[in-house]
Protein backbone atom coordinates (compact mmCIF):
# COMPACT_ATOMS: atom_id res chain seq x y z
CA UNK A 1 0.00 0.00 0.00
CA UNK A 2 1.39 3.41 -0.99
CA UNK A 3 2.15 5.73 1.88
CA UNK A 4 -0.19 8.66 2.33
CA UNK A 5 0.81 11.90 0.64
CA UNK A 6 -0.47 15.38 1.43
CA UNK A 7 -0.95 17.42 -1.73
CA UNK A 8 -1.22 21.19 -1.69
CA UNK A 9 -1.33 21.93 -5.42
CA UNK A 10 -0.87 25.70 -5.27
CA UNK A 11 2.40 27.17 -4.09
CA UNK A 12 0.76 30.57 -3.79
CA UNK A 13 -2.66 32.20 -3.77
CA UNK A 14 -3.43 35.91 -4.04
CA UNK A 15 -6.69 37.32 -2.68
CA UNK A 16 -8.10 40.83 -2.39
CA UNK A 17 -8.80 42.08 1.11
CA UNK A 18 -12.38 41.35 2.14
CA UNK A 19 -12.70 38.33 -0.13
CA UNK A 20 -12.49 34.64 0.72
CA UNK A 21 -9.37 32.54 0.18
CA UNK A 22 -9.59 28.91 -0.83
CA UNK A 23 -6.62 26.78 0.22
CA UNK A 24 -6.58 23.38 -1.43
CA UNK A 25 -5.39 20.14 0.15
CA UNK A 26 -5.92 16.50 -0.72
CA UNK A 27 -4.80 13.21 0.75
CA UNK A 28 -3.91 10.15 -1.30
CA UNK A 29 -5.11 7.71 1.39
CA UNK A 30 -7.36 7.47 4.44
CA UNK A 31 -4.76 5.41 6.30
CA UNK A 32 -3.41 5.95 8.90
CA UNK A 33 -6.52 7.23 10.61
CA UNK A 34 -6.19 10.56 12.34
CA UNK A 35 -7.25 14.17 12.01
CA UNK A 36 -6.28 16.90 9.55
CA UNK A 37 -5.21 20.31 10.79
CA UNK A 38 -4.35 23.55 9.02
CA UNK A 39 -1.66 25.87 10.37
CA UNK A 40 -0.30 29.26 9.40
CA UNK A 41 3.46 29.19 9.63
CA UNK A 42 5.76 26.38 10.68
CA UNK A 43 7.63 25.36 13.81
CA UNK A 44 6.75 25.91 17.43
CA UNK A 45 5.04 29.24 16.85
CA UNK A 46 2.64 28.10 14.15
CA UNK A 47 -0.97 29.20 14.44
CA UNK A 48 -3.81 26.67 14.34
CA UNK A 49 -6.32 27.68 11.66
CA UNK A 50 -8.54 24.61 11.58
CA UNK A 51 -8.76 21.31 13.46
CA UNK A 52 -10.96 18.57 12.04
CA UNK A 53 -11.51 17.05 15.49
CA UNK A 54 -12.67 19.95 17.56
CA UNK A 55 -12.86 23.67 18.06
CA UNK A 56 -14.79 26.61 16.69
CA UNK A 57 -13.33 28.31 13.61
CA UNK A 58 -15.98 30.83 12.54
CA UNK A 59 -14.11 32.16 9.49
CA UNK A 60 -13.20 28.72 8.15
CA UNK A 61 -15.43 26.43 6.12
CA UNK A 62 -14.46 23.14 4.54
CA UNK A 63 -14.94 22.89 0.80
CA UNK A 64 -15.92 19.21 0.93
CA UNK A 65 -18.17 17.38 3.35
CA UNK A 66 -15.74 15.96 5.89
CA UNK A 67 -18.37 13.64 7.35
CA UNK A 68 -18.18 11.50 4.19
CA UNK A 69 -16.36 8.33 5.18
CA UNK A 70 -14.35 8.29 1.95
CA UNK A 71 -13.46 11.99 1.89
CA UNK A 72 -9.92 12.82 0.78
CA UNK A 73 -10.44 16.56 0.14
CA UNK A 74 -9.48 18.78 3.08
CA UNK A 75 -9.50 22.13 1.31
CA UNK A 76 -10.70 25.10 3.33
CA UNK A 77 -12.07 28.55 2.63
CA UNK A 78 -11.21 31.49 4.91
CA UNK A 79 -13.66 34.38 4.78
CA UNK A 80 -13.12 38.13 5.02
CA UNK A 81 -9.39 38.08 4.36
CA UNK A 82 -7.29 40.92 5.80
CA UNK A 83 -3.58 41.71 5.39
CA UNK A 84 -2.98 40.08 8.78
CA UNK A 85 -3.90 36.73 7.22
CA UNK A 86 -0.92 36.75 4.86
CA UNK A 87 1.51 33.89 5.34
CA UNK A 88 2.20 30.30 4.42
CA UNK A 89 -0.53 27.78 5.23
CA UNK A 90 0.21 24.11 5.82
CA UNK A 91 -2.22 21.21 5.63
CA UNK A 92 -1.01 18.61 8.12
CA UNK A 93 -2.08 14.99 8.58
CA UNK A 94 -1.84 13.54 12.07
CA UNK A 95 -2.02 9.88 12.95
CA UNK A 96 -3.89 8.84 16.04
CA UNK A 97 -1.89 8.61 19.24
CA UNK A 98 -2.35 8.64 22.98
CA UNK A 99 -2.59 10.96 24.75
CA UNK A 100 -1.82 13.20 21.77
CA UNK A 101 -2.05 12.64 18.04
CA UNK A 102 1.28 12.51 16.23
CA UNK A 103 2.16 14.67 13.23
CA UNK A 104 2.50 12.30 10.30
CA UNK A 105 2.94 14.33 7.12
CA UNK A 106 2.65 17.94 6.01
CA UNK A 107 1.84 19.48 2.68
CA UNK A 108 4.42 21.71 1.02
CA UNK A 109 2.53 24.84 2.02
CA UNK A 110 0.57 27.51 0.19
CA UNK A 111 1.62 31.14 0.49
CA UNK A 112 -1.34 33.50 0.84
CA UNK A 113 -0.78 37.09 -0.23
CA UNK A 114 -3.37 39.79 0.28
CA UNK A 115 -3.97 42.53 -2.27
CA UNK A 116 -5.40 45.88 -1.37
CA UNK A 117 -9.17 46.07 -1.66
CA UNK A 118 -10.10 47.54 -5.06
CA UNK A 119 -11.28 51.11 -4.72
Amino acid sequence: EDELQVIQPEKSVSVAAGESATLRCAMTSLIPVGPIMWFRGAGAGRELIYNQKEGHFPRVTTVSELTKRNNLDFSISISNITPADAGTYYCVKFRKGSPDDVEFKSGAGTELSVRAKPS
Epitope: L30, I31, P32, V33, P35, Q52, K53, E54, E65, L66, T67, K68, R69, N70, R95, K96, S98, P99
Partner: antibody, heavy 118, light 107 residues
Framework: DVQLVDSGGGVVRPGESLRLSCAAS????????MSWVRQAPGKGLEWLAG????????YYIDSVKGRFTISRDNSKNSLYLQMNSLTAEDTAVYYC???????????WGLGTLVTVSS | ALTQPASVSANPGETVKITCSGG??????YGWYQQKSPGSAPVTVI????KRPSDIPSRFSGSASGSAATLTITGVRVEDEAVYFC???????????FGAGTTLTVL
Protein backbone atom coordinates in the same frame (compact mmCIF):
# COMPACT_ATOMS: atom_id res chain seq x y z
CA ASP B 1 -28.83 18.88 25.82
CA VAL B 2 -28.46 16.48 22.91
CA GLN B 3 -31.61 14.42 22.49
CA LEU B 4 -32.43 11.67 19.99
CA VAL B 5 -35.94 10.22 19.99
CA ASP B 6 -36.57 7.08 17.94
CA SER B 7 -40.05 6.17 16.75
CA GLY B 8 -41.91 4.13 14.16
CA GLY B 9 -41.41 0.64 15.57
CA GLY B 10 -44.17 -1.90 15.85
CA VAL B 11 -45.31 -5.37 14.88
CA VAL B 12 -45.28 -6.31 11.20
CA ARG B 13 -45.56 -9.51 9.19
CA PRO B 14 -42.66 -11.02 7.23
CA GLY B 15 -42.24 -9.33 3.86
CA GLU B 16 -43.79 -6.06 5.01
CA SER B 17 -42.12 -2.64 5.32
CA LEU B 18 -41.60 -0.13 8.10
CA ARG B 19 -40.13 3.34 8.31
CA LEU B 20 -38.31 4.40 11.46
CA SER B 21 -37.72 8.01 12.42
CA CYS B 22 -35.28 9.74 14.75
CA ALA B 23 -36.00 13.29 15.90
CA ALA B 24 -32.88 15.21 16.90
CA SER B 25 -32.59 18.28 19.10
CA UNK B 26 -30.00 20.15 21.15
CA UNK B 27 -27.31 20.31 18.45
CA UNK B 28 -26.79 21.42 14.86
CA UNK B 29 -28.16 18.30 13.19
CA UNK B 30 -26.96 19.26 9.71
CA UNK B 31 -23.33 19.22 10.88
CA UNK B 32 -23.24 15.59 11.99
CA UNK B 33 -23.17 12.22 10.31
CA MET B 34 -25.70 9.79 11.79
CA SER B 35 -26.14 6.02 12.01
CA TRP B 36 -28.65 3.30 12.82
CA VAL B 37 -27.68 0.45 15.15
CA ARG B 38 -29.87 -2.46 16.24
CA GLN B 39 -29.94 -5.04 19.01
CA ALA B 40 -31.79 -8.31 18.57
CA PRO B 41 -33.26 -9.90 21.72
CA GLY B 42 -30.48 -11.32 23.88
CA LYS B 43 -27.82 -10.28 21.35
CA GLY B 44 -25.21 -7.57 20.97
CA LEU B 45 -25.15 -4.32 19.03
CA GLU B 46 -25.07 -4.37 15.23
CA TRP B 47 -24.33 -1.31 13.10
CA LEU B 48 -26.62 -1.14 10.09
CA ALA B 49 -26.12 2.08 8.16
CA GLY B 50 -24.59 5.54 8.25
CA UNK B 51 -25.21 8.79 6.40
CA UNK B 52 -23.05 11.88 5.93
CA UNK B 53 -24.12 15.24 7.34
CA UNK B 54 -25.46 16.51 4.04
CA UNK B 55 -27.08 13.22 3.19
CA UNK B 56 -25.24 12.64 -0.08
CA UNK B 57 -23.24 9.60 1.05
CA UNK B 58 -24.66 6.46 2.64
CA TYR B 59 -23.03 3.30 3.95
CA TYR B 60 -24.53 -0.09 4.81
CA ILE B 61 -23.61 -3.42 6.29
CA ASP B 62 -23.87 -6.14 3.65
CA SER B 63 -26.81 -7.94 5.28
CA VAL B 64 -29.20 -4.98 4.81
CA LYS B 65 -27.93 -3.55 1.50
CA GLY B 66 -30.78 -3.34 -0.98
CA ARG B 67 -33.46 -3.79 1.71
CA PHE B 68 -32.82 -0.87 4.05
CA THR B 69 -32.38 2.79 3.09
CA ILE B 70 -31.04 5.46 5.41
CA SER B 71 -32.00 9.07 4.72
CA ARG B 72 -32.32 12.40 6.47
CA ASP B 73 -34.18 15.69 6.27
CA ASN B 74 -31.99 18.40 7.75
CA SER B 75 -34.81 20.94 7.55
CA LYS B 76 -36.77 18.74 9.96
CA ASN B 77 -33.81 17.61 12.10
CA SER B 78 -34.84 14.05 11.33
CA LEU B 79 -33.17 10.77 10.40
CA TYR B 80 -35.01 7.86 8.78
CA LEU B 81 -34.59 4.16 8.11
CA GLN B 82 -36.83 2.63 5.47
CA MET B 83 -36.94 -1.14 5.98
CA ASN B 84 -38.37 -3.39 3.27
CA SER B 85 -38.84 -7.18 2.93
CA LEU B 86 -38.62 -7.62 6.68
CA THR B 87 -37.91 -11.07 8.15
CA ALA B 88 -38.00 -12.49 11.66
CA GLU B 89 -34.22 -11.91 11.87
CA ASP B 90 -34.90 -8.14 11.73
CA THR B 91 -36.71 -8.27 15.08
CA ALA B 92 -34.71 -5.93 17.33
CA VAL B 93 -34.54 -2.63 19.14
CA TYR B 94 -33.35 0.00 16.66
CA TYR B 95 -31.28 2.96 17.85
CA CYS B 96 -30.22 6.07 16.02
CA UNK B 97 -26.82 7.41 17.03
CA UNK B 98 -24.87 10.58 16.39
CA UNK B 99 -21.42 10.08 14.95
CA UNK B 100 -18.21 11.66 16.17
CA UNK B 101 -15.78 13.22 13.68
CA UNK B 102 -14.22 9.77 13.16
CA UNK B 103 -17.46 7.78 12.83
CA UNK B 104 -17.78 6.38 16.32
CA UNK B 105 -20.87 7.27 18.38
CA UNK B 106 -21.31 9.79 21.16
CA UNK B 107 -25.08 10.02 21.66
CA TRP B 108 -27.77 7.38 21.26
CA GLY B 109 -31.52 7.37 20.88
CA LEU B 110 -33.74 5.58 23.37
CA GLY B 111 -34.58 2.91 20.83
CA THR B 112 -37.72 1.68 19.11
CA LEU B 113 -38.77 -1.99 19.05
CA VAL B 114 -39.48 -3.70 15.73
CA THR B 115 -41.10 -7.13 15.88
CA VAL B 116 -41.48 -9.19 12.70
CA SER B 117 -43.86 -12.07 13.26
CA SER B 118 -46.49 -13.99 11.36
CA ALA C 1 -14.48 -9.40 14.32
CA LEU C 2 -13.86 -7.79 17.69
CA THR C 3 -13.16 -10.12 20.61
CA GLN C 4 -13.83 -9.26 24.25
CA PRO C 5 -14.29 -11.39 27.38
CA ALA C 6 -17.84 -12.53 28.10
CA SER C 7 -17.66 -11.49 31.74
CA VAL C 8 -15.49 -9.89 34.38
CA SER C 9 -16.11 -9.34 38.09
CA ALA C 10 -14.60 -7.13 40.73
CA ASN C 11 -15.12 -5.85 44.25
CA PRO C 12 -16.05 -2.20 44.79
CA GLY C 13 -12.96 0.00 44.70
CA GLU C 14 -10.91 -2.37 42.56
CA THR C 15 -9.59 -1.60 39.10
CA VAL C 16 -11.20 -3.40 36.18
CA LYS C 17 -9.70 -3.78 32.72
CA ILE C 18 -11.71 -5.00 29.72
CA THR C 19 -9.84 -5.71 26.52
CA CYS C 20 -11.04 -5.69 22.93
CA SER C 21 -8.92 -7.11 20.13
CA GLY C 22 -9.26 -7.52 16.41
CA GLY C 23 -8.61 -4.16 14.80
CA UNK C 24 -5.56 -2.82 13.01
CA UNK C 25 -4.12 0.10 15.01
CA UNK C 26 -3.43 2.32 12.01
CA UNK C 27 -6.88 1.99 10.44
CA UNK C 28 -9.12 1.64 13.49
CA UNK C 29 -10.63 3.88 16.15
CA TYR C 30 -12.26 2.27 19.19
CA GLY C 31 -15.16 3.24 21.43
CA TRP C 32 -16.77 1.77 24.54
CA TYR C 33 -20.51 1.70 25.19
CA GLN C 34 -22.27 0.93 28.47
CA GLN C 35 -25.68 -0.74 28.53
CA LYS C 36 -27.27 -1.18 31.95
CA SER C 37 -30.14 -3.40 30.82
CA PRO C 38 -31.04 -5.16 27.56
CA GLY C 39 -32.92 -2.85 25.21
CA SER C 40 -32.03 0.30 27.13
CA ALA C 41 -30.13 3.05 25.35
CA PRO C 42 -26.35 2.57 25.31
CA VAL C 43 -24.21 5.29 26.84
CA THR C 44 -20.86 6.18 25.33
CA VAL C 45 -18.16 6.08 28.00
CA ILE C 46 -15.14 6.34 25.65
CA UNK C 47 -14.73 7.29 22.00
CA UNK C 48 -11.68 7.87 19.77
CA UNK C 49 -9.70 5.27 21.77
CA UNK C 50 -9.26 7.41 24.86
CA LYS C 51 -11.66 10.38 24.79
CA ARG C 52 -14.15 10.52 27.64
CA PRO C 53 -17.38 12.52 27.18
CA SER C 54 -17.69 15.37 29.65
CA ASP C 55 -20.54 13.76 31.58
CA ILE C 56 -18.71 10.45 32.16
CA PRO C 57 -16.87 10.02 35.49
CA SER C 58 -13.08 10.22 35.40
CA ARG C 59 -12.76 6.65 36.71
CA PHE C 60 -13.43 5.52 33.13
CA SER C 61 -10.44 5.64 30.79
CA GLY C 62 -9.49 4.07 27.50
CA SER C 63 -6.37 3.21 25.58
CA ALA C 64 -5.38 1.48 22.35
CA SER C 65 -2.17 -0.20 21.33
CA GLY C 66 -1.32 -2.64 18.58
CA SER C 67 -4.46 -4.54 17.63
CA ALA C 68 -6.28 -4.08 20.94
CA ALA C 69 -8.13 -1.50 22.99
CA THR C 70 -8.63 -1.45 26.75
CA LEU C 71 -11.34 0.06 28.93
CA THR C 72 -10.16 0.70 32.48
CA ILE C 73 -12.46 1.49 35.40
CA THR C 74 -10.40 2.68 38.34
CA GLY C 75 -12.23 2.30 41.64
CA VAL C 76 -15.24 0.47 40.27
CA ARG C 77 -18.62 1.17 41.83
CA VAL C 78 -21.79 -0.90 42.15
CA GLU C 79 -23.54 1.42 39.70
CA ASP C 80 -20.98 0.47 37.04
CA GLU C 81 -22.57 -2.98 36.72
CA ALA C 82 -23.54 -3.24 33.07
CA VAL C 83 -22.68 -4.82 29.76
CA TYR C 84 -19.80 -3.01 28.03
CA PHE C 85 -19.55 -3.22 24.26
CA CYS C 86 -16.42 -2.26 22.42
CA UNK C 87 -16.96 -0.77 19.00
CA UNK C 88 -14.63 0.08 16.16
CA UNK C 89 -14.59 2.12 12.99
CA UNK C 90 -12.33 0.84 10.23
CA UNK C 91 -11.05 3.52 7.87
CA UNK C 92 -10.24 0.95 5.20
CA UNK C 93 -13.73 -0.56 4.92
CA UNK C 94 -15.86 2.39 6.20
CA UNK C 95 -17.64 -0.11 8.47
CA UNK C 96 -18.51 -0.03 12.18
CA UNK C 97 -18.35 -3.25 14.18
CA PHE C 98 -19.04 -4.22 17.79
CA GLY C 99 -17.78 -6.86 20.14
CA ALA C 100 -20.24 -9.29 21.70
CA GLY C 101 -20.19 -7.44 25.02
CA THR C 102 -18.63 -7.98 28.45
CA THR C 103 -20.85 -8.31 31.51
CA LEU C 104 -19.30 -6.51 34.47
CA THR C 105 -20.42 -7.79 37.87
CA VAL C 106 -19.52 -5.77 40.95
CA LEU C 107 -19.53 -8.17 43.92
Amino acid sequence: DVQLVDSGGGVVRPGESLRLSCAASGFTFSSYAMSWVRQAPGKGLEWLAGISAGGSDTYYIDSVKGRFTISRDNSKNSLYLQMNSLTAEDTAVYYCARETWNHLFDYWGLGTLVTVSS
Amino acid sequence: ALTQPASVSANPGETVKITCSGGDYYSTYYGWYQQKSPGSAPVTVIHSDDKRPSDIPSRFSGSASGSAATLTITGVRVEDEAVYFCGAYDGRTYINTFGAGTTLTVL
